[in-house]
Amino acid sequence: KLTIESTPFNVAEGKEVLLLVHNLPQHLFGYSWYKGERVDGNRQIIGYVIGTQQATPGPAYSGREIIYPNASLLIQNIIQNDTGFYTLHVIKSDLVNEEATGQFRVYPELPKPSISSNNSKPVEDKDAVAFTCEPETQDATYLWWVNNQSLPVSPRLQLSNGNRTLTLFNVTRNDTASYKCETQNPVSARRSDSVILNVLYGPDAPTISPLNTSYRSGENLNLSCHAASNPPAQYSWFVNGTFQQSTQELFIPNITVNNSGSYTCQAHNSDTGLNRTTVTTITVYAEPPKPFITSNNSNPVEDEDAVALTCEPEIQNTTYLWWVNNQSLPVSPRLQLSNDNRTLTLLSVTRNDVGPYECGIQNELSVDHSDPVILNVLYGPDDPTISPSYTYYRPGVNLSLSCHAASNPPAQYSWLIDGNIQQHTQELFISNITEKNSGLYTCQANNSASGHSRTTVKTITVSAELPKPSISSNNSKPVEDKDAVAFTCEPEAQNTTYLWWVNGQSLPVSPRLQLSNGNRTLTLFNVTRNDARAYVCGIQNSVSANRSDPVTLDVLYGPDTPIISPPDSSYLSGANLNLSCHSASNPSPQYSWRINGIPQQHTQVLFIAKITPNNNGTYACFVSNLATGRNNSIVKSITVSASGTSPGLSA
């Protein structure tokens, strides 16, 4: 069927359009184009005879039309009146005619639009603004953009006049934005320049900063006022109702108690004609006195005396605070505060209560601290310690013992041998000792202030013969590959050599073995199960030697990966399944079995009589050692074949 396609269908003024003919019949004589929906000689545009290739203009020819041999018609420099229908009349050789009609539409190229407004300075919550997109254009669509986004849904926004007018009712400061309009038709789209809406608002209630309302005499008062407003607000300050100045900031240096009162900031917007005020009450306080601490006992005795610390001076309606060691008071049943917090009582003082202590007087502005006070707690003496720690000495050496006891004031020392007073010194020195110097050596420490005494007795043996040593250990059950163990050979003896044996052999060379403390301490790093041996220490000097009893190290290890035996995995139906699981572990591991993931029993041996193919599956043995905190497992697949179908094993 003969058809006509307009390319394009919508044509811009000044452009061109091609009326393209489809399905043109064979054996043509010629054809003619007409303006309109039918053949009308008065509206012929052009005719064309194929034989002569001759084109003949008609009454409707404008000089802008070109006809092509394939009957297509090109119209150039399109004008608005070209809009409409076009009919092609085809004359065939057999003089049978065919007709087809096509059409196109002509639209103007749109100009760049602009926005007009009915109110350039609307007032917030009062005015409405109507934006209109200019010019008014036929067959154009109007769109609006706010801050380059399409219009938000809002009951305060209304489109009218074919969307050409955008009205904002009851404008707010948030409507201050960039507005654009856009015109569109089928052949063009143009966007306007942006228009910024200038909404007049405020002033809001002003805020006065800083927020603090309490000041100390002698400080500077610097208040600043701010109110949201467009255009920016004009500010005025009033003190106790009296106008002061028209500035945003109020500055009063070196204030006194007389500057206390109500401070008002007034904000004014000349365009909206509105005023808003905010009042703050400023209180100026006189400088309080610096506090100090008095004590009812300057030299309290530990575990006997109580001490009452009082914060001076006494001021009515004042909050008193306390600090110990620059921290707030700890919770302790030995610390008591009076009802007004002015007196802090330390019940049964200890040497750790020395302080420093500070008290503070709090007013509305700040806290004034006293100077720190330190308590002189009398304590001790504690049990004296005698050094060195040796108890065995060889004849002929010098004996030099030193005594120390924690005490305040420092202790006075006395030495006694076998109950007989020797001297009143901290150190006792005896040269060239003999067996006769063996005995009980007592150090007595005395605190003259508290009147307390404490003693420590040490047995000194002067002998060529050494005692039988013993081994002490810092870890009786170390975990393999994790713990270290330190063995120490006791006692500590002067001028003595310490030796070690493992399983009756001298120490092997190993980076995991370390001797220290004059060989008196043997450390095994990262113990292994192979370290579970018999350890012996020995002591010797030039005249004697002695060995300890052996100490066996109990190393916790495992569980290692278990082994399931027998290793067979194929069984005949009717056989007995007897699986045994073993894992090296100390202590012995806890065993448990799972068949196809289902928990079974907690035994080392799993026995199933007369198995069938239903017993096929995975058999898992789990081992656990709570002492090492470690677990392990192994899985074995068991296949049971019906009797006679498999060369598998029978258990």
Epitope: P589, Q590, Y591, S592, Q601, H602, T603, F607, L626, A627
Partner: antibody, heavy 120, light 107 residues
Framework: QVQLVQSGAEVKKPGASVKVSCKAS????????LHWVRQAPGQGLEWIGY????????SYSQKFQGRVTMTRDTSTSTVYMELSSLRSEDTAVYYC?????????????WGQGTLVTVSS | DIQMTQSPSSLSASVGDRVTITCRAS??????LAWYQQKPGKVPKLLIY???NLVEGVPSRFSGSGSGTDFTLTISSLQPEDVATYYC?????????FGQGTKVEIK
């Protein structure tokens, strides 16, 4: 189901011996170790020792060493606990109990108890 | 031998109360600790092993915790049927030893 059935109550004179039996059923007898625990009237529980029915290995509390003997008969799935040189303070209920597994497990099934009274 | 010390020796609580019994070992037993319940005239019943593993069939109101030397049995909401004596026992090698027991009664 697992059951441990003990022999009946016994009255013995001081210096005599007593042999209490414990018959196991409902599980594989040789797979689980059996322990003996006693409880004097109004008192707590006291562990006596255990036997591995598979190997016959025994381990006794130091307190009962030399006076206690534990044996087993695998053909009847029965364990026995014999206590000799009885004294009045041996008056107690004697329980056999199965260990929940092997090595370092607690006791999950207990016999009904056998009251042994030692009195002159 | 490892000594086991239980506390308290007895307690009385109301139905619905949370009850806690503690057990202390004289040396490190890691997690090898069991709890038993013995009702008057009955045989002991295993509740918990490995310090915190609940035996199948034991109500979930029973729970155990602890490791090393200090252990706890908790009954979250005491019921009338929980009246019994509770024993702890270490199962870290022989000899096994029991605590002296804690008698739980209803107020």
């Amino acid at each position: 189901q697992v059951q441990l059935v003990q022999s009946g109550a016994e009255v013995k004179k001081p210096g005599a011996s007593v042999k209490v039996s414990c018959k196991a059923s409902g599980y594989i007898f040789t797979s689980y170790w059996l322990h003996w625990v006693r409880q004097a009237p109004g008192q707590g529980l006291e562990w006596i020792g255990y036997i591995n029915p598979n190997t016959g290995y025994t381990s006794y509390s130091q307190k009962f060493q030399g006076r206690v003997t534990m044996t087993r008969d695998t053909s009847t799935s029965t364990v026995y606990m014999e206590l000799s040189s009885l004294r009045s303070e041996d008056t107690a209920v004697y329980y056999c109990a199965r260990e929940y597994g092997n090595y370092n497990y607690p006791l999950d099934y207990w016999g009904q108890g056998t009251l042994v009274t030692v009195s002159s | 031998d490892i000594q086991m010390t239980q506390s308290p020796s007895s307690l009385s609580a109301s139905v619905g109360d949370r009850v806690t019994i503690t057990c202390r070992a004289s040396e490190n037993i890691y997690g090898y600790l069991a709890w038993y319940q013995q009702k008057p005239g009955k045989v002991p019943k295993l509740l918990i092993y490995n310090a915190k593993n609940l035996v199948e069939g034991v109500p979930s109101r029973f729970s155990g915790s602890g490791s090393g030397t200090d252990f706890t049995l908790t009954i979250s909401s005491l019921q009338p049927e929980d009246v019994a004596t509770y024993y702890c026992q270490h199962h870290y090698g022989t000899p096994y030893t029991f605590g002296q027991g804690t008698k739980v009664e209803i107020k």
